[in-house]
């Protein structure tokens, strides 16, 4: 895990896009893949386990001249909490990776509250890059316009 971070809490939620598509995790050939698709109203949505961490942001990094704190998350399918959503900075994809011990930096995302209903996930290892939706897949999106809908997600309590 990242130095200086401490676990605050964890909770399950379902994850859906701005356009009300569901993020789900499907087992294919022994590996989980991430799907973004329309799910029926009666269909039970897949859940993610969100682990919330507090991370100090020293004055030297904050740009404000004062110390700050960020709220970060990592996310696992409830079906298998030993794998994490992972930002692949090589091909700008979002993958599920199994970890032996603690999650690497690529599995941490800074939480942005975008509105009363929506959040965004900024890659810890790629500032200015967010989890987004591209062609019905999760991908890493360099967001110039932070209000862009394709980086907004709704977390629904179970």
């Amino acid at each position: 895990s990242i130095q200086g971070t401490s676990l605050l809490t964890q909770s399950p939620a379902s994850l859906s896009t701005y356009n009300d598509q569901s993020v789900s995790f499907v087992l294919e050939n022994g590996c989980y893949v991430i799907n973004v698709d329309d799910s029926g109203k009666d269909q039970e949505q897949d859940q993610v386990l969100l682990r919330y961490y507090e991370s100090p942001c020293p004055a030297s990094q904050s740009g404000d001249g004062v110390d700050g704190k960020k709220l970060m998350v990592n996310m696992s399918p409830i079906k298998d909490t030993d794998i994490w959503l992972h930002a692949n900075d090589k091909d700008y994809s979002v993958e599920l990776q199994r970890g032996d011990v603690s999650p690497p930096e690529q599995a941490f995302f800074v939480l942005h509250k975008k509105s009363s209903d929506f959040v965004s996930f900024e890659c810890k290892n790629l500032p200015g890059t967010y989890i987004g939706v591209k062609d019905n897949q999760l991908a890493l999106v360099e967001e110039k316009d932070e209000s862009c809908n394709n980086i907004m997600f709704k977390l629904s309590k179970i």
Epitope: Y52, G65, L71, L111, K113, S147
Partner: antibody
């Protein structure tokens, strides 16, 4: 260091619009949300609304039809407007800053000293 | 909107006493609860955030517990400077509602 300072008229007439400004220093409005909270004399705290780091707003549902929060980033100011005021809007008005970058989950760590607004003719 | 119910509304206690204040949310808010202390004529001060985390500079005699809907603020050994009003606030979803407050008075 981080500071928030409320300013505006201390007396507003009924049916008029209450306008207050929160001038901030020591942090960026693009990173932290700023909230308005009020406290009628001798009573508890009431959350009015928030201007989030990304620019969106959220309001107390009971006040939503009368309240507007906006910002002037160049002046490091967040403004509150409350229309059609009555005596029930008499209160100390506070602005406060989020504890965390980009979200309100951690509460409000920095507060202004508050300004008393009396609604009376 | 989420309603926050604090109890008791006031408590009389002596220096050295253990004081417990509870806060009940009308629906689950996870761990997203803060506690504030307010003295007359002053702005509120953040004591506890994320239900259990002590804010910077707050004495360790203050502690928070709970998650979901039931939360507690405990002052393990009341000091003269602790006589004040305490508020809980939920930060799970907007509007970010406060409890009605608990006044801790000198017995």
């Amino acid at each position: 260091q981080v500071q928030l300072q409320e300013s505006g008229p201390g007396l507003v007439k009924p049916s008029e619009t209450l306008s207050l400004t929160c001038t901030v220093s020591g942090f960026s409005l693009s990173k932290y949300g700023v909230h308005w909270i009020r406290q009628p004399p001798g009573k508890g705290l009431e959350w009015i609304g928030v201007l989030r780091a990304g620019g969106s707003t959220g309001y107390n549902s009971a006040l939503m039809s009368r309240v507007t929060i906006s910002k002037d980033t160049s002046k490091s100011q967040v403004s509150l407007k409350l229309s059609s005021v009555t005596a029930a809007d008499t209160a100390v008005y506070y602005c406060a800053r989020d504890h965390y970058y980009y979200s309100s989950y951690g509460g409000f760590v920095y507060w202004g000293q508050g300004t008393l607004v009396t609604v009376s003719s | 909107d989420i309603q926050m119910t604090q109890s008791p509304s006031s408590v009389s206690a002596s220096v050295g006493d253990r004081v417990t204040i509870t806060c009940l949310a009308s629906q689950t808010i996870g761990a997203w609860l803060a506690w504030y202390q307010q003295k007359p004529g002053k702005s509120p001060k953040l004591l506890i955030y994320a239900a259990t985390r002590l804010a910077d500079g707050v004495p360790s005699r203050f502690s928070g517990s709970g998650s979901g809907t039931d939360f507690t603020l405990t002052i393990s050994s009341l000091q003269p400077e602790d006589f004040a009003t305490y508020y809980c606030q939920q930060l799970d979803s907007s509007p970010y509602t406060f409890g009605q407050g608990t006044k801790v008075e000198i017995k």
